[in-house]
Every structure is written in C-alpha cells, then in structure tokens.
Interface confidence: low
C-alpha cells in the first residue's frame, strides 16, 4: 500500500512565542500538494517537538477530499486508550472512539478539511498521531511522534562561599546547563512524572580572579544565559542577572 | 468521574495557622496542574496559589507570599495549601481547582471549604 | 482593584443577546489565553469558555468568546433564565507570574 510523507523542505513554523497564540504546523499548501502528489509513496513518520501552550495542526497526507473513502485519525496518548476520529465521505458521518481531550478536534468540518488540531498543546498531548487516508488508490498514511517541550524556568543563585547553583526547573526535555569560566561542578537531575525534567548544577570556584560567573542553559526552546558575581562573604546572598 | 474535595477550614484566630487538603480523584492527578482559588463573602475569585504537575514550580499571589505554601503528594492525589499568619481578609470560600497547565484554564472546581479568621 | 476590569452588572430579556466586555493589559489578555467562568448562585464557578474561544462539550452555542488586542468578549444570545449568574474572565499574566480575574459581572434576566 502506497503512503504519503512530508515535503522533506517544509520547516516548522511558529508564529509567536506567546502562550497560547502561537501556532505551529507542518501542513502543505495547495500547490505544494498538486507539485508533490507524485512523489508521497513512502510512509515517513515525522518526530515534531511542538512547544508547550502552543496550538497545533496536524495534517494529513497530501490527497485530494474528491479521491477519498475515509480519513482516520489514530491518536495513542501516554496512559490512554487509542482514541480514533474517523470520517466517512460517502455517508458524510464522523465517528469517534476513546476520545476524551476536548482540546484535540477536526480543524474545521472534515469533508473540507482533514487536518487535526491540537488547542494549546500540554504535556499531556505527547504522543502519536497518525492519519490513514482511505482512496481508491490506496491507502496513504501520515504519522507524527509529537515531542511536547515545556522551557524551563532558569534560576541562579550563590549558596556559599564561591559556590552557585544554577537550575533548569521543569523543562522537557532536561535542558544542559553549562559554566564559563568552568569550575569544579556536581549536576543532578530530577525526574518528574508528568515527563519534566529539573537540572541542577552546583559549581565551586576557588580561583579567587574569578569575579563573575555565566550559567549558560541551552534547551530546545532557547537559550539563557545568568551571571553572578561571586561575593567572598560567606552566606551573603547576591541576585543573578540575565543577559 | 472527577471529583475534588476540600477540607480542612473552619475558624481560626489571626496570627494562626490551618492546612487545607484537596482530595482529588477520577484523573490522573500527576498529569493536571493545580491551584487554589478563593472568594471573600459577596466577593468576586481570587487566584491564591498554583503548582506544576510534579510539583518543582510553585506561583503565589502577591496576597499570600510568604505565607501560604502549595504543595502536593502525587502518590496520594491530594493537593495541600498551608497557610500561616492568617489575617482577617484571607477569611473565604476556598476552591481547589485542575488545570491542563499552571498558566492555563481551570476545568474542573471543587466544591469549596470555608476558612474564618476571626478572634 | 482587579487586574482585569468587567463591568459589574449586565441585564437583558430572555431571548435577548448580552455581551460582557474583559480589559487587561499585553502581559495578560493580549498574550495569554482568556477563560471565562459561570458561577451560579451558591455553587462553584464552572469553566464556561477556554483559549480565548472554545466552549468545552456541555456548554451551549449560546455563548461565545472573543478577543481582541488586550480585550475580550462573552457573548450570551437567546437568553435565559438559568443563565442569570456572575461571569468571571481570567488570564495568566506574565508580569506578575499569576492567574487574574476579572472583578465578575452579574448577569440578571429581567
């Protein structure tokens, strides 16, 4: 059985990083489905990291609605039964099974649109979605592993004397935290179980010409970077600032 | 079918303390931030407190910073607020209520407890 | 004072259509999902509408949301008697790392 895959020079795109308006897609256009329809045969299953409070739209194979029977989608959500969305063309009837997140929904009424989307995405919504278009030519797939990002908060502080911690708190996935100038460094991770990860690290400076410090955490989501300066006052406590 | 339960109000002198609970079940409750919102006799909602699914980032209201202390026990699906300093305005109906993300819509509400700070 | 402003009080006639009005500010309403929330008398608030919009299944078509810019909108149309109520909008705000309401508005049906 034939199935359709991704333009392989379509980027992800976000329009703003503000929650709950930003809005992400991997969709073709018109064009793109007439100038690409020859050459979707084989199934791809596309991993896409979606930031968390961001909306997304999942698409379907690139088909013409004429040429189509049914359009499935099969949505495996962590802990949670297969929930199927399906659409039948000849009787113009939507069935669904299992689904329970109100957030995830036809984009608008499926004979004019087959893409599913998911409304301000939470971690919850890690998982796998796949659209099986039903035509008399075959049948043509679309697959996504979608990857939730969650940006960590960042914090920096000095704990002791020429020792700071820098945390990554809760991001997805964990985020590395680095230090310029490099000291003598401990970092521990903690797991949380809804999938976010916090990222510690301790780092003592005995050099005393160090002064300044950097904490540089780099995650999916972006990049921050905090410095602190050193106090020599054991126990005193200084506010990190951000580039 | 989710359900969240409060308890732990009644009345307390100013300058005291109480703990409330919330009781949450017919979710997974690791999986839904939480949060707490009160409401003053014959007033309007008042956002208190919220905290993350695992717990690791907790938001307070200007209100109740330094005061009050969400937390929550995953393994036990309760949802706690320990408040301290108690003052005659924290005196309300407090709410614990779900929500998909901290920063996000509260979907299910329960059903309240009320806390009087009166000597 | 309420980061977010309502009007106090709205009324209409049944059938009639009411909008409620919810003014914030770009830290909140203009960069973050609104809620709106129905409480009826003596009962805890209900969610009402969700990211700016959407009604969760349960809720009537009778009520939509809006936004635009730092504002949004409920609006109720064929009114009736069990929609009287108080009707609260809310946001996160990023400046103050919170949720905010609005002060409510009571909605009588005259």
């Known amino acids: 059985e034939g199935a359709a895959q991704p333009n392989n020079s379509l980027m992800l795109q976000t329009s703003k990083e503000n929650h709950a308006l930003a809005s992400s897609s991997l969709c073709m256009d018109e064009k793109q489905i007439t100038q690409n329809y020859s050459k979707v045969l084989a199934e791809v299953n596309t991993s896409w990291p979606v930031k968390m409070a961001t909306n997304a739209v999942l698409c379907c194979p690139p088909i013409a609605l004429r040429n189509l029977i049914i359009i499935t989608w099969e949505i495996i959500l962590r802990g949670q039964p297969s929930c199927t969305k399906a659409y039948k063309k000849e009787t113009n009837e939507t069935k669904e099974t299992n689904c329970t997140d109100e957030r995830i929904t036809w984009v608008s009424r499926p004979d004019q649109n087959s893409d599913l989307q998911i409304r301000t995405v939470a971690i919850t919504h890690d998982g796998y979605y796949r659209c099986i278009m039903v035509t008399p030519d075959g049948n043509f797939h679309r697959g996504y592993h979608l990857q939730v990002l969650v940006t960590p908060e960042v914090t920096l502080f000095q704990n002791r004397n020429r020792t700071a911690v820098c945390k990554a708190v809760a991001g997805k996935p964990a985020a590395h935290i680095s230090w310029i100038p490099e000291g003598d460094c401990a970092t521990k991770q903690e797991y949380w179980s809804n999938g976010t990860v916090t990222v510690k690290s301790t780092c003592h400076w005995e050099v005393h010409n160090v002064s300044t410090v950097t904490c540089h955490v780099s995650h999916l989501t972006g990049n921050k970077s905090l410095y602190i300066e050193l106090l020599p006052v054991p126990g005193a406590k200084k506010s990190a600032k951000l580039y | 079918e989710v359900q969240l339960l409060e308890s732990g109000g009644g009345l307390v002198q100013p300058g005291g303390s109480l703990r409330l609970s919330c009781a949450a079940s017919?979710?997974?409750?690791?999986?839904?931030?939480m949060s707490w919102v009160r409401q003053a006799p014959g007033k309007g909602l008042e956002w208190v407190s919220a905290?993350?699914?695992?717990?690791?980032?907790?938001y307070y209201a200007d209100s109740v910073k330094g005061r009050f202390t969400i937390s929550r026990d995953n393994s036990k699906n309760t949802l706690y607020l320990q408040m301290n300093s108690l003052r005659a305005e924290d005196t309300a109906v407090y709410y614990c209520?779900?929500?998909?993300?901290?920063?996000?819509?509260?979907?299910?509400w329960g059903q309240g407890t009320l806390v009087t700070v009166s000597s | 004072q309420s980061v977010l402003t309502q009007p106090p009080s709205a009324s209409g006639t049944p059938g009639q259509r009411v909008t409620i009005s919810c003014t914030g500010s770009?830290?909140?309403?203009?960069?973050?999902?609104v809620t709106w929330y129905q409480q009826l008398p003596g009962t805890a608030p209900k969610l009402l509408i969700y990211?700016?919009?959407h009604r969760p299944s349960g809720v009537p078509d009778r009520f939509s949301g809006s936004k635009s810019g730092t504002s949004a909108s409920l609006a109720i149309s064929g009114l009736r008697s069990e929609d009287e109520a108080d009707y609260y909008c809310?946001?996160?705000?990023?400046?103050?790392?919170?949720?905010?309401f609005g002060g409510g508005t009571k909605l009588t049906v005259l």
């Open positions: 209520a779900r929500g998909p993300e901290v920063m996000l819509e509260f979907d299910y």
């Open positions: 017919g979710f997974t409750f690791s999986d839904y931030a």
């Open positions: 905290i993350s699914h695992g717990g690791s980032s907790k």
């Open positions: 770009s830290s909140n309403i203009g960069n973050n999902a």
């Open positions: 990211s700016d919009n």
């Open positions: 809310a946001a996160w705000d990023s400046s103050l790392s919170g949720y905010v």
